[in-house]
């Protein structure tokens, strides 16, 4: 049975201050370690308890990290991405893509599905338009009676 999972995709700038044990998260991905099919991006695999990221609360497991201190993470080897974080300094600015699931359906491992999804407005706008047209038609019909 093939289901479809739709996502609301949002971006956010997250500024973290490195704590005593660092930034407090793990990553997967890179050109040599694709985690999502046809996407060599860097994803948050683990948020460490009581770490800087966990205490801040905005970064989530599954988020895609687009840049670190303005440096793009596209087309990087996994270890190069790790090194970039480790050398990022005390104040670290992350550009992050959140993906919120808005419709349940069968889904496998993140790496096995289509990561793109559909932004929710793509679904809501046509539904809203159809509703308005139907309401207008109904009102016209009533006026003719």
């Amino acid at each position: 049975m093939n289901g479809r999972v739709d996502y609301l995709v949002t971006e956010e700038e997250i500024n973290l201050t490195r704590g005593p044990s660092g930034l407090g998260f793990n990553i997967v991905g890179g050109t040599d370690q694709q985690y999502v099919s046809n996407d060599s991006g860097i994803y948050v695999s683990r948020i460490k308890e009581n770490g800087a990221a966990a205490l801040d609360g905005r970064l989530q497991e599954g988020d895609k990290i687009l840049s670190v201190n303005g440096q793009d993470l596209k087309n990087l080897l996994h270890q190069d991405a790790v090194d970039l974080f480790r050398n990022a300094g005390y104040a670290v600015s992350l550009r992050v893509q959140h993906r919120l699931q808005v419709q349940n359906g069968p889904i496998g491992h993140r790496g096995e599905g289509d990561p793109s999804g559909i932004p929710i407005f793509m679904v809501l706008v046509p539904v809203f338009a159809l509703t308005m047209v139907a309401a207008w038609a109904f009102m016209r019909y009533r006026q003719q009676l």
Partner: nanobody
Amino acid sequence: HVQLVESGGGLVQPGGSLRLSCAASGFTLDYYAIGWFRQAPGKEREGVSCISSSDGSTYYADSVKGRFTISRDNAKNTVYLQMNSLKPEDTAVYYCAADFGSSVDSTCLNNQQYDYWGQGTQVTVS
């Protein structure tokens, strides 16, 4: 359900060898860093060796460099620790641990980064 099971420990004479195995179930090793740690009576748990989640880079504590070798077999979902030229000071309970992805903060020899631990296997060199 993530589970790690160590085996291969035992009693060995100084200069002898042992091969420890860490069998993983409930997940595949592909995206996991795996570490071997040990704890001797009355001492803190220390990192022995680990293998990264990405390119299979290996790391060793200074005390075991040149004597211990870590390797992974993704097909068997198992990580091995080959221990040669064993010394009495290698006596400890040996644990394997797994962590999803790579920590952006520290190398895989840092035991605080690991989420999943096995029950341990006793190694005695005497």
